[in-house]
Each structure stands twice: as structure tokens, then as C-alpha cells.
């Protein structure tokens, strides 16, 4: 028995070949012997049943001269899954058609971090097929009647080429995924005390009309609990602020990409934020983490202090040195001090490996004089 795979809504071609490789009489039937179509010697396609009943069934007349009498079934339905019989040259050939339906749950437009389940459904009780989907960038996901893709990323967007294999027979279909998300899952901003701060949250997708709502929660390093800094709505890509904290005095841009500014980087603002964006007609939320590291350099009485506040990595090094001189102190910690610093220009650097994340300079006028 020959097996043919077909996807619901598409077309399938069931083969039937003459050993003579020339035109001959043939009949296609259902397994219950009802006639579908055939050719009875005059080169004319004869259909069985009423036209409306069999209007999806056809053959390739152009192939008959070569001894090929395929049955074409268009707009495949799940109930087309059955055995079809081709009668010719006093023999019968059975062809098994397996029609499958593909469903995507929750859909092909998803949010970053969500999962997609691809399910093959069929009326026939076939053994497990192999389903394999390959992204144009090379990523491959495989399964059987159920294929799962978890923790989707923006990079997983675009066209996937999927093949269903059963008994060495293949059928392919495509799916286009659209994974909505921020360009970066996390970002970090380094600022000296008093500098202006800008946070940008660019989306990794473009849509003509984008509607939803969002909020930025902030966990300051020095605070015991997080605080909602701003809530906003998004309507047709226009941002409107609904509620904003009075400290800090935040401003938010009215158009995309989402953008926030603080007039000053202050130690009490150093910490981590989580911007969430809920999009209309989508379950779940998009998230982007943002971190603010603030550097403060001050001279108090007889001590020069450099301190960084906010989420730094343990590999980061804080260095305090006089400009154009060797480092006086350099430690993997968040505060460094020099007692009785010499007069002149001092520099504090926050670095990771050989990369300087930020630096701040201070003029030490004389020992024992406050200068920030």
C-alpha cells in the first residue's frame, strides 16, 4: 500500500502507474467501491456521483499518455484520510492518504519568553510521524505529533520550513513566527552623580498600530521595597503618561521607542528597574530590565572617597588615582578611599577587565578642605 501525506486545505496527488507506460482504462474508487473518476477508453475524464460531490477530485490528463493516472484531491479535508483504490490493467492499487491539520497554540504571533506548541491532528490512527521545523538561521526543532518551542526569542521570528515524515514519505509546510519583544532583555546605564540619565526601550518589531499599557517599577539599592515610577498607555504608537512619581521628576517621550529621562543621577536612584509592557490582544507581558549605576566622588575632611552604587558585577574594579600617575587604590569593591590625598586632579575609574565603564574627576585643592 502506497502512503501519501497531505495538509488540510492543500492538494494531494495519489499515484497510479501503468506498466505499459501508455494510456489505458483506469478507475479511481473509494474503499467502499464508490466510483470517483476514471477514463473508459475515449480519453475523456468521467466523474462519478454528482458534480458538487466530486468537484475537488481531478486527474492530470497530460500525464495519461505516459501511463500515469494520478488522483488529485484539492482543498483537502480531514475526512479525506482513507484508502483509495486505483483499478487498471486487471489489477488494483491501494493508496493510503493521511491528511493532517496543523494548529499553533497560542498562535504564530507571540511575546518574547512565551512558548509555542505545534500540533498535528488527523482522523487516521497513524504511527508517530516525525515533525521537524528549521529556521532560516539554522535552528532546528523536532517532535512527533506535538512539537514544542519554549522560551521564544525575538531572533526566532521569521519563516520556518517544517517537514512531516511518515514511512519515508515527506510533506512540508511553512510557518511565519512573529516574536514580539524588546531589542535587549537587559541594559545598564553608568552615570556620574548629577548627570542626566536617559533610558531607552527599543522594540525589536514594527507594527503599524501598537496599543497597550506599561509600567516601570524601580528597586533602588538603598530602598527596602520597589516603587512604581511611571505608568503609561500606548495607543497607535503614541505614549501618554497616566501616573508618574514626583521623586524623581521623570519625563517620558510621547513617541516610540519608549524613552525616559531623569534630570539627575543621584545615589538614591541607583538600582534596577523592570519595564513591563502589556499589548492589546496579547496574553502576557513584555519585560525589559534596566540598571542604573551611579558614581560619587567626594572629599570630606582628610579623605577622598569614590563610591559606586547600583548593580555592579563582582569582576568590576574601582580605581582611585592622581591623573597621569599610578593607581593609589584599586579594588574589586564598591568604595575606595585615599586618606590625606595630594593636591591636584584625581580620577576614579570603574572598569571591567580592560574596559572602562565610567570615570569621574575631582580637583583636590588642599588637604582637609571639602570639595565635591
Amino acid at each position: 500500500k502506497t502512503l501519501v501525506l497531505g495538509k488540510e486545505g492543500e492538494s494531494a496527488e495519489l499515484p497510479c502507474e501503468s506498466s505499459q507506460k501508455k494510456i489505458t482504462v483506469f478507475t479511481w474508487k473509494f474503499s467502499d467501491q464508490r466510483k470517483i473518476l476514471g477514463q473508459h477508453g475515449k480519453g475523456v475524464l468521467i466523474r462519478g456521483g454528482s458534480p458538487s460531490q466530486f468537484d475537488r477530485f481531478d486527474s492530470k490528463k497530460g500525464a495519461w499518455e505516459k501511463g500515469s493516472f494520478p488522483l488529485i484531491i484539492n482543498k483537502l479535508k480531514m475526512e479525506d484520510s482513507q484508502t483509495y483504490i486505483c483499478e487498471l490493467e486487471n489489477r488494483k492499487e491501494e493508496v493510503e492518504l493521511w491528511v493532517f491539520k496543523v494548529t499553533f497554540s497560542p498562535g504564530t504571533s507571540l511575546l518574547q519568553g512565551q512558548s509555542l506548541t505545534l500540533t498535528l491532528d488527523s482522523n487516521s490512527k497513524v504511527s508517530n510521524p516525525l515533525t521537524e521545523c528549521k529556521h532560516k538561521k539554522g535552528k532546528v526543532v523536532s517532535g512527533s505529533k506535538v512539537l514544542s518551542m519554549s522560551n521564544l526569542r525575538v531572533q526566532d521570528s521569521d519563516f520556518w520550513n517544517c517537514t512531516v515524515t511518515l514511512d519515508q514519505k515527506k510533506n512540508w509546510f511553512g510557518m511565519t513566527l512573529s516574536v514580539l519583544g524588546f531589542q535587549k532583555a537587559s541594559s545598564i546605564v553608568y552615570k556620574k552623580e548629577g548627570e542626566q540619565v536617559e533610558f531607552s526601550f527599543p522594540l525589536a518589531f514594527t507594527v503599524e498600530k501598537l496599543t497597550g499599557s506599561g509600567e516601570l517599577w524601580w528597586q533602588a539599592e538603598r530602598a527596602s521595597s520597589s516603587k512604581s515610577w511611571i505608568t503609561f498607555d500606548l495607543k497607535n504608537k503614541e505614549v501618554s503618561v497616566k501616573r508618574v512619581t514626583q521623586d524623581p521628576k521623570l519625563q517620558m517621550g510621547k513617541k516610540l521607542p519608549l524613552h525616559l529621562t531623569l534630570p539627575q543621577a543621584l545615589p538614591q536612584y541607583a538600582g534596577s528597574g523592570n519595564l513591563t509592557l502589556a499589548l492589546e490582544a496579547k496574553t502576557g507581558k513584555l519585560h525589559q530590565e534596566v540598571n542604573l549605576v551611579v558614581m560619587k566622588v567626594a572629599q570630606l575632611n582628610n579623605t577622598l572617597t569614590c563610591e559606586v552604587m547600583g548593580p555592579t558585577s563582582p569582576k568590576m574594579r574601582l580605581t582611585l588615582k592622581q591623573e597621569n600617575q599610578e593607581a593609589r587604590v584599586s579594588e574589586e569593591q564598591k568604595v575606595v578611599q585615599v586618606v590625606a590625598p595630594e593636591t591636584g586632579l584625581w580620577q576614579c575609574l570603574l572598569s571591567e577587565g580592560d574596559k572602562v565603564k565610567m570615570d569621574s574627576r575631582i580637583q583636590v585643592l588642599s588637604r582637609g578642605v571639602n570639595q565635591t
Epitope: 542626566q196 497607535n236 503614541e238 503618561v241 519625563q251 517621550g253 529621562t261
Partner: antibody, heavy 119, light 107 residues
Framework: EVELLESGGGLVQPGGSLRLSCAAS????????MSWVRQAPGKGLEWVSG????????YYADSVKGRFTITSDNSKNTLYLQMNSLRAEDTAVYYC????????????WGKGTTVTVSS | AIQMTQSPSSLSASVGDRVTITCRAS??????LGWYQQKPGKAPKVLIY???SLQSGVPSRFSGSRSGTDFTLTISSLQPEDFATYYC?????????FGQGTKLEIK
């Protein structure tokens, strides 16, 4: 070609009301954000009020908040500014301006209508 | 509200001169700033949008630039028709705010 034409200006006593209109032609009104900008005699430009393309969000300068109301009627392609509790300092030429679709800048302006608040 | 500080308030120059006008924003406003020209008795018209994009139909002698929160309008070679008042406008967020204006006069 997009054109904006303001009307409704005139002389009004302090405490009085006036409604300005801005009729737009040559554009799909609901697509664009719109603003009212004024200029007192011999002074600079002052942004007064704005409305989003959908008409759902309205915005005001602190100087007019609670006294002025911006609305739009998409079926008539018209923008309105209802001005109540008028003061002498509201005396100005009032311009309506259309914003770009992808940019916020005001790319089309009307010729203006003069409002004088005086007893 | 975001404050826009424009300078100078007035400027005398001659035809052919290179002129710069600056605006400073009290907050970061990305590139969301436009430059407008106004002549007496007329409505303003946009010259530059998004800090440095030249509006269609505006002569190329007008240019805009940004450095942080400082924005500059430059007229490379003044023409007689350029004598007017110039305003910057931040359209980053509501309420929008204009600079105080710069009156450019013939020397």
C-alpha cells in the same frame, strides 16, 4: 494640499467664553495629532493644547488647564478650542497646527485667529 | 514641564554671515526638537525637525545639530529673506514648550 483655517476669534470680556474652530482640508483628520499655539502681541510662541489623533488623549499648558478644552470632530474634520473664564493674558493670535504622522513636529499651520480679552 | 532656554534673544548680522542659535533642554529629549521661522504677521513654518532633518522645500543653508541636551540651528550664509524670528520647540513630551525666540535683524 493640506490647509487649516481658524475661526471664532473676537473681542470678549474677562470671565467670558469663546470657541475657536479649525477646519482642515486635504487630510484624514483622525490620523494626526493636532495642537493649538498662541502668540500674545509682541511676545513669543506658546503651546496651549494638544489632542491625539484618536481624540482620546488631550493635553494642556499649565496656564490654561481647567479653563480650556480641546476637542475634535473627525466627521467634520474640525478641531475646537473651548475657552472659558478668559483673562486679559489670554489675548493673542491663536494658531492651529497639524503634526506629522511619524514625527511630532508641526508641519502645517493655519493663518491664525485673533482673540482679544478686554473690558 | 521641560524648560527650553534659547539664546541669544536677538542677533544682528549681515547678508552672507554664518549664524548659530542654540537651545538647551532642562531634560534629555532625544532628538525631539524642531526649529521654526516666523515673519511678522505670518504663521510659523518648520525648518528643521528631529533636531537635524531638513523639512522639504527648506534651503540647505539651514541645518540643525544636537549635543546631549544642547541643540543648534545654523544658517551657513544669511540671505535677505532669512531675517525673521526663530523658535525651537521640544516635542518630546507634553506639555510642548517653545524657546523664548531669537530675533535675527539686519546689521
Amino acid at each position: 494640499e493640506v490647509e487649516l483655517l481658524e475661526s471664532g476669534g473676537g473681542l470678549v470680556q474677562p470671565g467670558g467664553s469663546l470657541r475657536l474652530s479649525c477646519a482642515a482640508s486635504g487630510l484624514t483628520f483622525s490620523t494626526f495629532a493636532m495642537s493649538w499655539v498662541r502668540q500674545a502681541p509682541g511676545k513669543g510662541l506658546e503651546w496651549v493644547s494638544g489632542i491625539s489623533g484618536s481624540g482620546e488623549n488631550t493635553y494642556y499648558a499649565d496656564s490654561v488647564k481647567g479653563r480650556f478644552t480641546i476637542t475634535s470632530d473627525n466627521s467634520k474634520n474640525t478641531l475646537y478650542l473651548q475657552m472659558n473664564s478668559l483673562r486679559a493674558e489670554d489675548t493673542a493670535v491663536y494658531y492651529c497646527a497639524k503634526e506629522g504622522y511619524n514625527w511630532n513636529y508641526m508641519d502645517v499651520w493655519g493663518k491664525g485667529t485673533t482673540v482679544t480679552v478686554s473690558s | 514641564a521641560i524648560q527650553m532656554t534659547q539664546s541669544p534673544s536677538s542677533l544682528s548680522a549681515s547678508v552672507g554671515d554664518r549664524v548659530t542659535i542654540t537651545c538647551r533642554a532642562s531634560h534629555g529629549i532625544r532628538n525631539d526638537l524642531g526649529w521654526y521661522q516666523q515673519k511678522p504677521g505670518k504663521a510659523p513654518k518648520v525648518l528643521i525637525y528631529e533636531a537635524s532633518s531638513l523639512q522639504s522645500g527648506v534651503p540647505s543653508r539651514f541645518s540643525g545639530s544636537r549635543s546631549g541636551t544642547d541643540f543648534t540651528l545654523t544658517i551657513s550664509s544669511l540671505q535677505p529673506e532669512d531675517f525673521a524670528t526663530y523658535y525651537c520647540l521640544q516635542d518630546y513630551t507634553y506639555p510642548y514648550t517653545f524657546g523664548q525666540g531669537t530675533k535675527l535683524e539686519i546689521k
